[in-house]
């Protein structure tokens, strides 16, 4: 069964800066990745970035840099201030569209006990939805 993992890290040097990393553990070919915050995309969440392996990358503030790390993982740097700044309990979600597995989505947030600059290991997060 495919799995999606989500890792959220707050940068020690900039407390309003977050790095989100997501990965897909499956054998299929990824056709689209959508990163959102505030909940799953389409269920109250707001899209931060969309990454298409053959067409490119689209991002919206406060996303600063979305990129592919490998064929099956992505990272996103967020920088914000004021209303557009993420906070420690913000939920980030990643949805991977893959053939032939379909769409798989998982969410994560900053570990409650983590200090800035520390992060939880990138273990698979609970799968919230598989279309």
């Amino acid at each position: 069964t495919p799995e999606v993992w989500v890792q959220v890290r707050m940068e020690a040097t900039e407390l309003s800066s977050f790095t989100i990393r997501c990965g897909f553990l499956g054998s299929g070919s990824i056709s689209l990745v959508t990163v959102s915050w505030g909940g799953p995309n389409g269920a109250g969440g707001t899209t931060l970035a969309v990454l298409h392996p053959e067409r490119g990358i689209r991002q919206w503030a406060p996303a600063r840099q979305a990129r592919w790390e490998t064929q099956s993982s992505i990272s996103l740097i967020l920088e914000g201030s004021g209303a557009s700044s993420p906070c420690a309990n913000t939920t980030f979600c990643c949805k991977f569209a893959s053939f032939p597995e379909g769409s798989w989505e998982a969410c994560g947030s900053l570990p409650p006990s983590s200090d800035p600059g520390l992060s939880a290991p990138p273990t698979p997060a609970p799968i919230l939805r598989a279309d």
């Epitope: 298409h52 392996p53 053959e54 067409r55 490119g56 990358i57 689209r58 840099q65 592919w68 490998t70």
Partner: nanobody, 118 residues
Amino acid sequence: EVQLVESGGGLVQPGGSLRLSCAASETYFDLYVMGWYRQAPGKDRELVATITYTGSIYYVDSVKGRFTISRDNAKNSLYLQMNSLRAEDTAVYYCNADPSGLGRKVYWGQGTMVTVSS
């Protein structure tokens, strides 16, 4: 399918300048890496310069200080300002785009000829 169309090539004297442009058909997504390559007659295609959508730039040593690569993300357009041109810069210049930055799918333009001659 991303289409790339170059323009701006031509004949120029040594020491002169040219500005190449490359327009991409993709208007929704940013192309992660865009670059210029060139192929001189009888030689292999070689990298000239690349730029990511976040602005990271790379130049091959032979053009550093003479060529400037830039891009307009809003238009997904790529530019190459070429100054102090030399005879050895004569080549067909190709625009290249790697949307993911991973090389999974790479697109090429048809090329534009630059001739440096007196």
